[in-house]
């Protein structure tokens, strides 16, 4: 079994973590995918997930987390905007494949968020942008739990992460629609 590996990213409060998790295109394109934080003792907590089935290039926002699944590139893009010190932790992308265990996309991301601000170049000003402010909403049944195994039997594809400047609003490039997670009461 392959040992779980990590990539460390040190960012400042207010910045955006931008992670691309690769997956096998043909096999997992329409599978539901999720972003999880690993609690103490290898206990993943699901923070956000795509629709089921996952739609191509269709952003889903849950609080400060935005997921976008690019089927034609075989990658899940995860953005955490306006980072806070409390966001520091170990994260992973997973693909749900019930009733089997989730398929983890590697490497895991060790996020360290520190106080203060370090500016980085902004996004391309010439690109067409729509700005969305989505309130945090809740549903009990949206994401299955499906606990994750500790090791895998195949070599992990890489995750990549970028940094962008902070913004009180979320800029989604060339987006015509965004999924609002329904409220459950």
């Amino acid at each position: 079994a392959t040992k779980l590996t990590e990539e460390k990213y040190e960012l400042k409060e207010g910045q955006t973590l931008d992670v691309k998790c690769d997956y096998t295109l043909e096999k997992f394109a329409s599978s539901q995918k999720a972003w999880q934080i690993i609690r103490d003792g290898e206990m993943p907590k699901t923070l956000a997930c795509t629709e089921r089935p996952s739609k191509n290039s269709h952003p889903v926002q849950v609080g400060r987390i935005i997921l976008e699944d690019y089927h034609d590139h075989g990658l899940l893009r995860v953005r955490m905007v306006n980072l806070q010190v409390e966001d520091s932790g170990l994260y992973q992308c997973v693909i749900y494949q019930p009733p089997k265990e989730p398929h983890m996309l590697f490497d895991r991301i060790r996020l360290v968020v520190t106080k203060g601000f370090s500016g980085t170049p902004g996004s391309n000003e010439n690109s067409t942008q729509n700005v969305y402010k989505i309130p945090p909403t809740t549903t009990k049944a949206l994401c299955p739990l499906y606990t994750s195994p500790r090791t895998v039997t195949q070599a992990p594809p890489k995750s990549t992460a970028d940094v962008s400047t902070p913004d009180s609003e979320i800029n989604l490039t060339n987006v015509t629609d965004i999924i609002r997670v329904p409220v459950f009461n």
């Epitope: 609690r39 103490d40 003792g41 290898e42 206990m43 907590k45 699901t46 923070l47 956000a48 997930c49 849950v62 609080g63 400060r64 987390i65 955490m80 806070q84 409390e86 966001d87 009733p99 265990e101 309130p135 945090p136 909403t137 809740t138 549903t139 009990k140 049944a141 949206l142 994401c143 299955p144 739990l145 499906y146 606990t147 994750s148 195994p149 500790r150």
Partner: antibody, heavy 120, light 111 residues
Framework: QVQLVQSGAEVKKPGASVKVSCKAS????????MHWVRQAPGQGLEWMGV????????SYAQKFQGRVTMTRDTSTSTVYMELSSLRSEDTAVYYC?????????????WGQGTTVTVSS | DIVMTQSPLSLPVTPGEPASISCRSS???????????LDWYLQKPGQSPQVLIY???NRASGVPDRFSGSGSGTDFTLKISRVEAEDVGVYYC????????FGGGTKVEIK
């Protein structure tokens, strides 16, 4: 229906160990974390730890580190909580509780409780 | 560790009247996904606890709509719009943001 059934009451001597079981039924055992919570007589609830029944990994409250061991048997859909080096302060009702699915981390199903008495 | 502080310790209530319990955490329970990891439980006399509210404001299945949860960050409130006799027991808040910690409990009893 979803149910957690715990083992019966125990009386132990100080310094001994106790092992409490919690048998799950009515749902997919490996898809939900299981917590252990205790309650001393006349006191509030105290979280002890959690086990992932799928892989068997655990996370314990700092207070119980080194004294508590949580295990599971997937063939019988049962989780176990063993507490060693017992002292009188460990006299309590011990509950197992299932953690909800998805975003929800509430403990949505509870066992009936197991009374453990530590007395010389 | 996060410390959870509940008030009041004891709450004598009159059936049909509203009731309110406060819970304060020593750290913010708001996660990056916009959810407050704060739950409310009721332990009726001689019974196991049962969940009332999860993620700060969401009623658990089968819980009457007279129960509601509100708040964000570090300050949370459980409200009972019209107390009924069956609502007596000890109410606990619990945080699930960093590990799991229960508040000390609030005993609700009929006047």
């Amino acid at each position: 229906q979803v149910q957690l059934v715990q083992s019966g009451a125990e009386v132990k001597k100080p310094g001994a160990s106790v092992k409490v079981s919690c048998k799950a039924s009515g749902y997919t055992f490996t898809s939900y974390y299981m917590h252990w919570v205790r309650q001393a007589p006349g006191q509030g609830l105290e979280w002890m730890g959690v086990i992932n029944p799928s892989g068997g990994s655990t996370s314990y409250a700092q207070k119980f580190q080194g004294r508590v061991t949580m295990t599971r048997d997937t063939s019988t859909s049962t989780v176990y909580m063993e507490l060693s080096s017992l002292r009188s302060e460990d006299t309590a009702v011990y509950y197992c509780a299932r953690e909800g699915s998805g975003y929800d981390e509430s403990m949505d199903v509870w066992g009936q409780g197991t009374t453990v008495t530590v007395s010389s | 560790d996060i410390v959870m502080t509940q008030s009041p310790l004891s709450l004598p209530v009159t059936p049909g009247e509203p009731a309110s319990i406060s819970c304060r955490s020593s750290q913010s329970l708001l996660h990056s996904n916009g959810y407050n990891y704060l739950d409310w439980y009721l332990q009726k006399p001689g019974q196991s606890p049962q969940v009332l509210i999860y993620l700060g404001s969401n009623r658990a299945s089968g819980v009457p709509d007279r129960f509601s949860g509100s708040g964000s960050g570090t300050d949370f409130t459980l409200k009972i719009s019209r107390v009924e006799a069956e609502d007596v027991g000890v109410y606990y808040c619990m945080q699930a943001r960093h590990g799991f910690t229960f508040g000390g409990g609030t005993k609700v009893e009929i006047k």
